[in-house]
């Protein structure tokens, strides 16, 4: 099985009440604008076939996609939360920059690609949905990486 290295985040990243609250507030505001409740981006399908030791690497991919392809294009919306949450998530992404797995990661890339395709297919409403799931992104990152 692939071995992951440097795929760890310090628990203290998730023990900051202020930024945690802002992240959840941003998610709540965006999810109230999401009218497609049948689709969930961060759920069982995303992690299917991914071992415990690979979960953080997968979440790194999801985090980077969310930052680059979702939050930056929508950066003028959902203020003032967005301007505080984006730098926080960017710091987490930077902390995971050396996280990789040795060996085949094709199964992980396939799962992440399905999430990307879903967001792209839904267009702007897909981006809103992804922002509405930032609470799940935050918690999944925490659970996979600490």
């Amino acid at each position: 099985a692939p071995v992951s290295s440097h795929c760890r985040l310090d628990k203290s990243n998730f023990q900051q009440p202020y930024i945690t609250n802002r992240t959840f507030m941003l998610a709540k505001e965006a999810s109230s604008a999401d009218n497609n409740t049948d689709v969930r981006l961060i759920g069982e399908k995303l992690f299917r076939g991914v071992s415990m030791s690979e979960r953080c690497y997968l979440m790194k991919q999801v985090l980077n996609f969310t930052l680059e392809e979702v939050l930056l294009p929508q950066s003028d919306r959902f203020q003032p939360y967005m301007q505080e949450v984006v730098p926080f998530l960017a710091r987490l992404s930077n902390s995971l920059s050396t996280c990789h797995i040795e060996g085949d990661d094709l199964h992980i890339q396939k799962n992440v690609q399905k999430l990307k395709d879903t967001v792209k297919k839904l267009g702007e409403s897909g981006e809103i949905k992804a922002i509405g799931e930032l609470d799940l992104l935050f918690m999944s990152l925490r659970n996979a990486c600490i």
């Epitope: 099985a1 628990k11 998730f14 961060i42 759920g43 069982e44 992690f47 299917r48 076939g49 991914v50 071992s51 415990m52 030791s53 979960r55 799940l136 918690m139 999944s140 925490r142 659970n143 996979a144 600490i146």
Partner: antibody, heavy 116, light 112 residues
Framework: QSVEESGGRLVTPGTPLTLTCTVS????????MIWVRQAPGEGLEWIGI?????STYYASWAKGRFTISRTSTTVDLKITSPTTGDTATYFC?????????????WGPGTLVTVSS | AVVLTQTASPVSAPVGGTVTIKCQAS??????LAWYQQKPGQPPKLLIY???TLASGVPSRFKGSGSGTEFTLTISDLECADAATYYC??????????????FGGGTEVVVK
Amino acid sequence: QSVEESGGRLVTPGTPLTLTCTVSGFSLSSYAMIWVRQAPGEGLEWIGIIDIDGSTYYASWAKGRFTISRTSTTVDLKITSPTTGDTATYFCARDRFVGVDIFDPWGPGTLVTVSS
Amino acid sequence: AVVLTQTASPVSAPVGGTVTIKCQASEDIYTNLAWYQQKPGQPPKLLIYWASTLASGVPSRFKGSGSGTEFTLTISDLECADAATYYCQACVYGNSADSRYTFGGGTEVVVK
């Protein structure tokens, strides 16, 4: 998608016993599996888990007392040296990670009685 | 290891009534909490995860809430079929895997 346990029976203390969990409708290459037990009239107690890559993790109290292994369609739980305190219904369940681990579905359970 | 303390059994209410079951964690578990229903002679059944997300096929009469150390399962419009024992279950990450999954002691619900 279902799981079913088998192999539970009456055994004497110290006699090793292997329970088998057979899965259908999904692949063990996609999901981790857990074992949980429940003594008569008591609550649920996590024993251990076997991951997709075959890695195993046990509750601290269960280390050395149980061994989990698997084939392509079954997951085994070996009780290495049963004592009367191991009398319980043993359940296996699929671990669905959705960002947090959740256990669904569960098998109906298999009863192990340890008595001299 | 985290300890989950549930409302003492039994909790009773009439058909059509409401019951509330509490689950207290000995440390902060964020929203890493699930609820399971178990009827006599049957395996547990997943009801709620992420503290408040309803599992597939579970009626909206079941509602989970809470985060951190205090969690609640509320069952409204009680039916006879809701008579069961309810368990909370926590996932704790970042520590040793030997204490990752913990169950509460269970709370029996009696429907009168």
